[in-house]
Amino acid sequence: VPRWRQQWSGPGTTKRFPETVLARCVKYTEIHPEMRHVDCQSVWDAFKGAFISKHPCNITEEDYQPLMKLGTQTVPCNKILLWSRIKDLAHQFTQVQRDMFTLEDTLLGYLADDLTWCGEFNTSKINYQSCPDWRKDCSNNPVSVFWKTVSRRFAEAACDVVHVMLNGSRSKIFDKNSTFGSVEVHNLQPEKVQTLEAWVIHGGREDSRDLCQDPTIKELESIISKRNIQFSCKNIYRPDKFLQCVKNPEDSSCTSEI
């Protein structure tokens, strides 16, 4: 008789999830010499241990601590690029501007980027049928807790001037319910971070509005200022310039350092 299985509202675990995580880990440690010491089998075991046999609505940050420990990585704290609702462009930027880092340029972020996973209570099976949706089911699911944990740690590590890329084409340019707005903003350390500089990316070719005057940007400025961190906002009008550089990565002069 087939065992009854919980139906969640979100998509199930990404197919070939274990193989994907392991392959990504091997690839990352080959490309990044400072992470060559990492044992990818141990990383996978720690990742698996965070959610396998556990109720997928009852995951805690503590569950991920063994993985966090294995994935400990030092990135230059003054070269951090946060983003909200504009992931692809942020990644194109750091692909060219190699000395800046998004969370997904770190080992743990790279492992989990665009993947979904969850298990089931009291069974060692991975659920490939469905996983909890953050809104419809529960917020303490394996994916949400993972990103909350790594995002918090990433923000806590930042120093000096921290940049955040925001999507000027969205109705809420700054959304306090996003990972940036709910986690990263509140975990920047005022004793280490001097300034948060927001880059508001414009979509339209002829767009010449000053989106730094948007009410949601004023809200972000207020939150940041109350935390004793200076705030700066810049309108960025030609995102196609990132793509032109990505198409020619061999051009070493295609960086902001001149």
Epitope: S208, D210, K241, Q244, D251
Partner: antibody, heavy 120, light 107 residues
Framework: QVQLVESGGGLVQPGGSLRLSCAAS????????MNWVRQAPGKGLEWVSG????????YYADSVKGRFTISRDNSKNTLYLQMNSLRAEDTAVYYC?????????????WGQGTLVTVSS | DIELTQPPSVSVAPGQTARISCSGD??????VYWYQQKPGQAPVLVIY???KRPSGIPERFSGSNSGNTATLTISGTQAEDEADYYC??????????FGGGTKVEIK
């Protein structure tokens, strides 16, 4: 090293046409926005026109819109400015300038300029 | 369109500090660039992105941008710094603007 060399300037009568060229070397030409900036004798700098690397996007100052056309040939590493219906106030040194990459929109490198004189 | 306003001239004694202002509405929301131009020569970028110095530009050149005003500061001015200086910004579309220029004279 980056080099920009303008050519095609000269004396032209009002209402006439001229085509300026800018030969680029020392960088991946197609990765960058390119621009024309001019400077009338004894005056300040005025941006004239810009073009994206691919080259789908073109931009013009109001003072030249409808009269000037910017274009580029990435296979020849060359930037062009076709100037029609020229007026006396178009008299200036015309500079070709390479844009900064990524989030910056300023001019990292300039050519030495070519003089355009519009006079009868 | 934003308009950038610069003083026509700034006079400074050798070794002293020259400050050139560039003002425009909400200028802090846009990156500002500074160019040096000597007679008969093409402009040279001395500051980009408000405060960054291109390689080869002496450390005595610095920039800042807050409120409605960007400032180019030349500390310990030298005779070779005598030139015209232009600020520039970009406010989207076809709105790429220069200030009117400031002549720096070393007394």
């Amino acid at each position: 090293q980056v080099q920009l060399v303008e050519s095609g300037g000269g004396l032209v009568q009002p209402g006439g046409s001229l085509r300026l060229s800018c030969a680029a070397s020392g960088f991946t030409f197609s990765s960058y926005y390119m621009n024309w900036v001019r400077q009338a004798p004894g005056k300040g700098l005025e941006w004239v026109s810009g073009i994206s690397g691919d080259p789908s996007n073109t931009y013009y100052a109001d003072s030249v819109k409808g009269r000037f056309t910017i274009s580029r040939d990435n296979s020849k590493n060359t930037l062009y400015l076709q100037m029609n219906s020229l007026r006396a106030e178009d008299t200036a040194v015309y500079y070709c300038a390479r844009d900064l990459p990524l989030v910056y929109t300023g001019f990292a490198y300039w050519g030495q300029g070519t003089l355009v004189t519009v006079s009868s | 369109d934003i308009e950038l306003t610069q003083p026509p001239s700034v006079s400074v004694a050798p070794g002293q500090t020259a400050r050139i202002s560039c003002s425009g509405d909400n200028l802090r929301h846009y990156y500002v660039y500074w160019y040096q131009q000597k007679p008969g020569q093409a402009p040279v970028l001395v500051i980009y992105g408000d405060s960054k110095r291109p390689s080869g530009i002496p450390e005595r050149f610095s920039g800042s941008n807050s409120g409605n005003t960007a400032t180019l500061t030349i500390s310990g001015t030298q005779a070779e710094d005598e030139a015209d200086y232009y600020c520039q910004t970009y406010t989207g579309g076809a709105s790429l603007v220069f200030g009117g220029g400031t002549k720096v004279e070393i007394k």
